[in-house]
């Protein structure tokens, strides 16, 4: 059975290039594409020099001068992505240090909940998005980003941290989700698969996309990441699916062309500043939103996830470069770095648009099972 062709106006149809998104049988997730629910790989860790620093190592974020008017975020710990080996597992390897979360990886002991109890929480990420069940919420207005078009200087740090490739963002990138929900961007990173195997973290009706970008933000209500961890809305992540398209994506090429320089785990390079917003879809008005967690230890909850309806197109060569260039721990390729989807446990995913109404001519108009009571502008 083929999934219905996704139109631009239907959930997750059409990338930034305006292409339609036909999902054929070959795109349906197979068993081996779907990490087991009981032992998923993970995502967002909060590393410092040696992955997760202790609380005393988290720098305080002091406002810069009035004239510059932004918070000093460049040294904050990050929220990053781990890997999913051929047999994805919800296990993190610890070195002999014991209980700290600084040296987890996939495929080893102990189970993540022993590394961080929050990993066994009820409201974890990523999740499977079922547009038919999403609650249309008119109060979810278009996202607004400010300061995301960066000049070439100063250069930015691009790092292979063994779990993902991460770009540290400078101070001054602001994101608004609505009243009382203003954020500053900290970093972005990617999740991907392997040859012929998709590697997005979130899925849509079970469909896994080739890759996914996450832009991680700290609420302006908090000066430090450690203060925000576990607090509702303390962190927010913008997520977008990456798909294969006919043309090279020039924005992504500015990063992908530098991956060979950081092939080795722990290596980093400096790249010129770029238009960060160009890495995201162009439609900021249509998205899904829910409250979840970081997807690696410490798996802290309270993270606001915003998943764009529109996808971003990369060429086949670019997707191959992403999945086939970097190396992770233990002489293993850095591939399949996504966590299995987690149960919603009663959570309702909200949509900024009526996602439950499928524009496919073959689909009967569905009943919207969930609703959002909040009013719009």
């Amino acid at each position: 059975q083929r999934l219905p062709r996704m139109q631009e106006d239907s959930p997750l149809g059409g990338g930034s290039s305006g292409e339609d998104d036909p999902l054929g049988e070959e795109d349906l997730p197979s068993e081996e594409d779907s990490p087991r629910e009981e032992d998923p790989p993970g995502e967002e860790d909060l590393p410092g020099e040696e992955d997760l620093p202790g609380e005393e190592d988290l720098p305080e974020v002091k406002p810069k001068s009035e004239e510059e008017g932004s918070l000093k975020l460049e040294d904050l710990p990050t929220v990053e992505a781990p890997g999913d080996p051929q047999e994805p597992q919800n296990n993190a390897h610890r070195d002999k240090e014991g209980d700290d979360q600084s040296h987890w990886r996939y495929g080893g002991d102990p189970p993540w909940p022993r590394v961080s109890p929050a990993c066994a929480g009820r409201f974890q990420s990523p999740v499977d998005i079922r547009p038919q069940l999403a609650a249309f919420c008119p109060a979810l207005r278009p996202l607004e980003l400010l300061g995301f078009q960066l000049p070439p200087l100063p250069e930015l740090r691009l790092r292979n941290n063994g779990h993902s490739v991460q770009l540290t963002l400078p101070p001054g990138l602001e994101m608004a989700l609505g009243p009382g929900r203003e954020y500053r961007a900290l970093q972005l990173h990617l999740h991907w698969g392997a040859a012929g195997r998709p590697g997005s973290e979130h899925t849509v009706e079970g469909h896994r996309f080739p890759a996914e970008i996450h832009v991680v933000h700290l609420s302006t209500a908090f000066a430090r990441v450690d203060e925000a961890l576990g607090r509702p809305g303390g962190l927010a992540v913008l997520a977008a699916f990456l798909e294969e398209g006919p043309e090279e994506n020039s924005a992504y090429e500015q990063l992908l062309s530098r991956l060979e320089e950081i092939a080795e785990e722990g290596s980093e390079t400096q790249v010129p500043g770029l238009d960060i917003s160009a890495l995201l879809p162009s439609d900021f008005s249509r998205y899904f939103q829910y409250e979840g967690s970081l997807t690696t230890p410490p798996c802290a909850q309270g993270v606001i996830w915003t998943v764009f309806n529109q996808t971003v197109m990369l060429s086949a060569k670019q997707l191959h470069t992403l999945s086939d260039t970097l190396w992770g721990p233990g002489d293993s390729r850095l591939q399949l770095n996504f966590r299995a989807t987690q149960p919603l446990n009663g959570r309702v995913i909200e949509a900024s648009f009526p996602a439950g109404v499928d524009s496919s001519p073959r689909a009967a108009e569905p009943v919207q099972l969930n609703s959002c009571l909040a009013a719009g502008d």
């Epitope: 406002p63 009035e66 004239e67 008017g69 932004s70 918070l71 207005r141 278009p142 607004e144 980003l145 400010l146 300061g147 995301f148 078009q149 001054g172 602001e174 608004a176 989700l177 609505g178 009243p179 009382g180 929900r181 203003e182 302006t220 238009d275 917003s277 160009a278 995201l280 162009s282 439609d283 900021f284 008005s285 502008d377």
Partner: antibody, heavy 119, light 107 residues
Framework: EVQLVESGGGLVKPGGSLRLSCAAS????????MSWVRQAPGKGLEWVAA????????YYLDTVKGRFTISRDNAKNTLYLQMNSLRAEDTALYYC????????????WGQGTLVTVSS | DIQMTQSPSSLSASVGDRVTITCKAS??????VAWYQQKPGQAPRRLIY???NRYTGVPDRFSGSGSGTDFTLTISSLQAEDLADYYC?????????FGGGTKVEIK
Amino acid sequence: EVQLVESGGGLVKPGGSLRLSCAASGFTFSNYYMSWVRQAPGKGLEWVAAINSDGGITYYLDTVKGRFTISRDNAKNTLYLQMNSLRAEDTALYYCARHRSGYFSMDYWGQGTLVTVSS
Amino acid sequence: DIQMTQSPSSLSASVGDRVTITCKASQNVVSAVAWYQQKPGQAPRRLIYSASNRYTGVPDRFSGSGSGTDFTLTISSLQAEDLADYYCQQYSNYPWTFGGGTKVEIK
């Protein structure tokens, strides 16, 4: 009803100072970013400065940096613009503007106060 | 700084005409564009935010479109009360910048 009322404009000599005020009412002032925007006589609009909801972060147009200071008193529901080292090219009608709640776009404007810098 | 180039600088049209004003950004501003109307002797009034979203209370003859660098404000059927200056503004990067304005006159 949202109301923004500017005051403090007037005639000042080059190099002089003025302090503009904007009294806000009809909304929870402390929840909103605020801006000052100016319009020279017969000309277009020019954004001057902005301030976040708690007053901790400010932004300025390059040509006023170091001369103008935007501030706010949330207890008094008032926005301020302290203007020092005024120049002839600062002559304009100065508007106070509120930003959409939780966003960066501006949605309400006052009627403006005229600042004239002339010897 | 991001330049917002607005055109035309002025236009004259009859009541009922369709009027289009364009704004071109010097670099990508995604959808962070607002449109304002300023009637003679008055403060600017909000019309559109996020390129295409009409504010509550704004007549539906006003519509906005575009993303990236090219944006359009359309008045589908010009009314006498639409005589005003119209400005686009980007709020994607500091400093926020406005277009030079378009004066709309009624024939």
